[in-house]
């Protein structure tokens, strides 16, 4: 077990803070909830603290919760491939570019680390080149979320990982908005981290609303499990 993994044996409170600017539309989001890495489970509620969110909530899911991939459930035979937990408590910097097909892109930079007993994800997001009447600024996405695979590989030069994956957002007219994600994670501290073999995270997310919440918000339930590496021979003969 890595030192960082020991911090995730129970339920951990999560705080998310985002400052965003998309085509000049500035906004802030605050999120709170908890994660349980034993089950790969996240429960979070996000509130736009600046009024109405200028982009659809589903376009921010990867920035919020795929930001705290340290809560992914890594099966016993894959624990030596869990970079995310191994970087804790000092944490990691997570940078992404998210390309929306036939539209603009988001660039994000986040620091994910423990502050006391709370896992904090502080994010800056900049979006450019979006069409004012497109699927994103035109709010044409359905309020739901599909399952995805998130592909992870080691980046030995930077002592971190590279990640890529594609999200499919459902559009109200029945079509799909594609969003191609390119991600890099590097540790904040200088302690040892686990550099993984190639594998992926399998994610399932459910979006809902709080009937008692008047502000623009999103409630998120997510399950994430690592896969893609088979048992070694030593595992088979135990």
């Amino acid at each position: 077990m890595s030192k960082g993994e020991e911090l995730f044996t129970g339920v951990v409170p999560i705080l998310v803070e985002l400052d965003g600017d998309v085509n000049g539309h500035k906004f802030s989001v605050s999120g709170e909830g908890e994660g349980d890495a034993t089950y790969g489970k996240l429960t979070l509620k996000f509130i736009c603290t600046t009024g109405k969110l200028p982009v659809p909530w589903p376009t921010l899911v990867t920035t919020f919760s795929y930001g705290v991939q340290c809560f992914s459930r890594y099966p016993d035979h894959m624990k030596q491939h869990d970079f995310f937990k191994s970087a804790m408590p000092e944490g990691y910097v997570q940078e992404r570019t998210i390309f929306f097909k036939d539209d603009g892109n988001y660039k994000t930079r986040a620091e994910v680390k423990f502050e006391g007993d709370t896992l904090v994800n502080r994010i800056e997001l900049k979006g450019i080149d979006f069409k004012e009447d497109g699927n994103i600024l035109g709010h044409k996405l359905e309020y739901n979320y599909n399952s995805h695979n998130v592909y992870i590989m080691a980046d030995k030069q930077k002592n971190g990982i590279k990640v890529n994956f594609k999200i499919r957002h459902n559009i109200e007219d029945g079509s799909v908005q594609l969003a191609d994600h390119y991600q890099q994670n590097t540790p904040i501290g200088d302690g040892p981290v686990l550099l993984p073999d190639n594998h992926y995270l399998s994610t399932q997310s459910a979006l809902s609303k709080d009937p008692n919440e008047k502000r623009d918000h999103m409630v998120l339930l997510e399950f994430v499990t690592a896969a893609g590496i088979t048992h070694g021979m030593d595992e088979l003969y135990k």
Epitope: M153, N164, K166, L178, D180, Y200
Partner: nanobody, 130 residues
């Protein structure tokens, strides 16, 4: 919406060759990593080979390495699969698939997963007799 149409399948004797083609229309062909998959009777659909947007990078699965060659012509919106030294175990329906991607690289594990692909052809049957 990208449409993909495969052709070139057929019946061939073991040791023979076939060249499959997949013609794309309705989108920017060069914006897609292209893959060839196959599905034998009662088997799961599996990746055979894939090629990056420009054609600079390719990937082959072990059973076809050294026998199959994937290539593309973006001016003709077409991807090819040259299959040599065919074996009876190559018998399957062969499908062409397109994965919209921003970078001109192959990510092996992403390309192996069917779920990465956005558009699929209807398939062409390849039968190799012994």
């Amino acid at each position: 919406q990208v449409q993909l149409v495969e052709s070139g399948g057929g019946l061939v004797q073991a040791g023979g060759s076939l060249r499959l083609s997949c013609a794309g229309s309705g989108g920017t062909f060069s914006a897609y990593t292209m893959g060839w998959f196959r599905q034998g009777l009662g088997e799961e659909r599996e990746l055979v080979a894939c090629i990056s947007r420009s054609g600079a990078s390719t990937f082959y699965t072990d059973p076809v390495k050294g026998r199959f060659t994937i290539s593309r012509d973006n001016d003709k919106n077409t991807v090819y699969l040259q299959m040599n030294n065919l074996k009876p175990e190559d018998t399957a329906v062969y499908y062409c698939a397109a994965d919209w991607t921003v970078i001109d690289e192959i990510t092996e594990q992403r390309s192996k997963h069917q779920t990465s692909y956005d558009y699929w052809g209807q398939g062409t049957q390849v039968t190799v007799s012994s």
